[in-house]
Amino acid sequence: REEAKPYPLFPGPFPGSLQTDHTPLLSLPHASGYQPALMFSPTQPGRPHTGNVAIPQVTSVESKPLPPLAFKHTVGHIILSEHKGVKFNCSISVPNIYQDTTISWWKDGKELLGAHHAITQFYPDDEVTAIIASFSITSVQRSDNGSYICKMKINNEEIVSDPIYIEVQGLPHFTKQPESMNVTRNTAFNLTCQAVGPPEPVNIFWVQNSSRVNEQPEKSPSVLTVPGLTEMAVFSCEAHNDKGLTVSKGVQINIKAIPSPPTEVSIRNSTAHSILISWVPGFDGYSPFRNCSIQVKEADPLSNGSVMIFNTSALPHLYQIKQLQALANYSIGVSCMNEIGWSAVSPWILASTTEGAPSVAPLNVTVFLNESSDNVDIRWMKPPTKQQDGELVGYRISHVWQSAGISKELLEEVGQNGSRARISVQVHNATCTVRIAAVTRGGVGPFSDPVKIFIPAHGWVDYAPSSTPAPGNA
């Protein structure tokens, strides 16, 4: 960027020519004399360089008519190659009587206010000042294409030059290139390629895996319809004009396929009835995963081998498998699907549920009084194996004794062997309510429905047992 520099003073009021990249403010002689110095207001660094000129301020205007002012005709069309330099100008002769005159450059209807290389030269004599406004571009680009004009304002009137058309020619320039795609096998798809000059026309050749597809070129824009692929291919297009050829980026067209199975499965957590798993999906087959399937089967060789299937969304690669048996071994496989189909199942992994508290109470609880030994005998059936949810370590017996104004609850632990217990009578002439729960290392299961028996005063005899029926036995 040029910095503002002081300008030298010329001897006398009319320098032969003045060439600058900056916008000069020029004071020319008055009728009664002249100001002996040239005054400059250089543009600030980074400010627009416009060829604005202030023409002599005259104290009195003669009444005789003046010829209409117009820019001289100049070259109307300049054709050049990209990166070359160009210089063009407007010239006009302005009678010295006009005042406050400015020249500016415009391109395609917009004033050029950028850091353009605009130079204004002045050739004054007694009657008129010849002004030549030059515009130069050191290395033209496509963006410099367009219609350039000079404008001059004199006493609020605007004089416009003929346009100078700049046409920058170069290799074709892509405005639309083919895009990478994932396509279904043997299914047609389109690729688009568009390039512009100048010079026009631009012709397109398509290339697949380094071989030309079309014998004859197509005018840009070109749409290539590929009838279908069976394997991955790389496509590009060549754009040709009189200046040469440009090749687009090569794009890979992938064939959608079924995904690969997951590469990892992790057992995050296990409870008595659930297993939390996560997985790392395999390669998606160039098509987004839609959902995943968790397959679960009992690992026990004696099981019937039936497979439970749990479907879930592809994200977040996490699933809690529920409704499992406690203390059981399972084989788990994961597969995921995309629009093409399901992946193979991952290698089967092993996972176990933990021990839980039994899910049901002991069955057929029976209570009767053994008066001779002053004991209450209790019998029951252990919960079904499937619902023990672990290894039974024993039972917890709750017995509540109620008589007038007294209520007393006692808890007893009984070992796992056998299915009977004996408790001492605590209170006579009272009701004894018995409930039993099975116990595993996983915890205490639910208590059975209460069974009540009346304990008479000493001397009464009542051997009738009280019981809860087994399920299905009314």
């Epitope: 590469t263 990892e264 057992i267 290698p347 092993l350």
Partner: antibody, heavy 128, light 111 residues
């Protein structure tokens, strides 16, 4: 093309340290577990350890403390940091992709299903 | 630690022979079948041949087959080809343990 390239091997004095690299191309470390295996001259294969896709590491009992596996997903590179090297650590060191891996997070162990892609190996010689 | 023992350690055979290599584990392999076989040629890395005890890896000729479950496994080459002279390793993992164990290897050489 899927490829593994080991580097960083060479001659090192006993007691020294060395960091091996395994550059991965054609697939992502963020979705595959990786392993290191070594082979002493004229001997069999010996597993060193594994790093899962999430970065969890598991090592052979003999390697714990001296050998550390790490990775940089942004560079798609796995590393093996070897400290306090001994003459018996002289071997060709291979990196390998784990075709499938099961992790037991609650119990802090994991099991390799198969090693389905191997690098060419890099020779480490520990000698004074 | 669990161990995998291969036998024989060396095997001399001719082109066209049927070759069998065994691999015995000191305890059950994970899921009874997570055992793989690898082939290695001098100066080259190992190459996966078989996984899940009997599944052929991609691109492996069908003359290779694997069998077995639990602790006893076998690799069979139905008709030995010149390209098959190499060292073969079995490998597997175990429940409760991260170690991936390799067998000691079986070198198949020309008779």
């Amino acid at each position: 093309e899927q490829q593994l390239v080991e580097s960083g091997g060479g001659l090192i004095q006993p007691g020294g340290s060395l960091r091996l690299s395994c550059a991965v191309s054609g697939f992502s470390l963020s979705s595959n577990a990786m392993s290191w295996v070594r082979q002493a001259p004229g001997k069999g294969l010996e597993w060193i350890g594994i790093i899962s896709s999430s970065g969890s590491t598991y090592s052979a009992s003999w390697a714990k403390g001296r050998f550390t596996i790490s990775k940089d997903n942004s560079k798609n590179t796995m590393y093996l940091q070897m400290n306090s090297l001994r003459a018996e650590d002289t071997a060709v060191y291979f990196c390998a992709r784990v075709g499938f891996f099961v992790g037991y997070g609650a119990y802090d162990y994991g099991i390799i299903h198969r090693l389905d892609l191997w690098g060419q190996g890099t020779l480490v010689t520990v000698s004074s | 630690d669990a161990q995998l023992t291969q036998s024989p350690s060396t095997l001399s055979a001719s082109v066209g022979d049927r070759v069998t290599i065994t691999c015995q584990s000191s305890k059950s392999i994970y899921n009874n079948n997570w055992l793989s076989w690898y082939q290695q040629k001098p100066g080259k890395p190992p190459k996966l041949l078989i996984y899940d005890a009997s599944d052929l890896a991609s691109g492996v000729p069908s003359r290779f087959s694997g069998s077995g479950s639990g602790t006893e496994f076998t690799l069979t080459i139905s008709s030995l080809q010149p390209d098959d002279f190499a060292t073969y390793y079995c490998a597997g993992g175990y429940s409760g343990d991260s170690d991936y164990a390799f067998g000691g290897g079986t070198k198949v050489e020309i008779k």
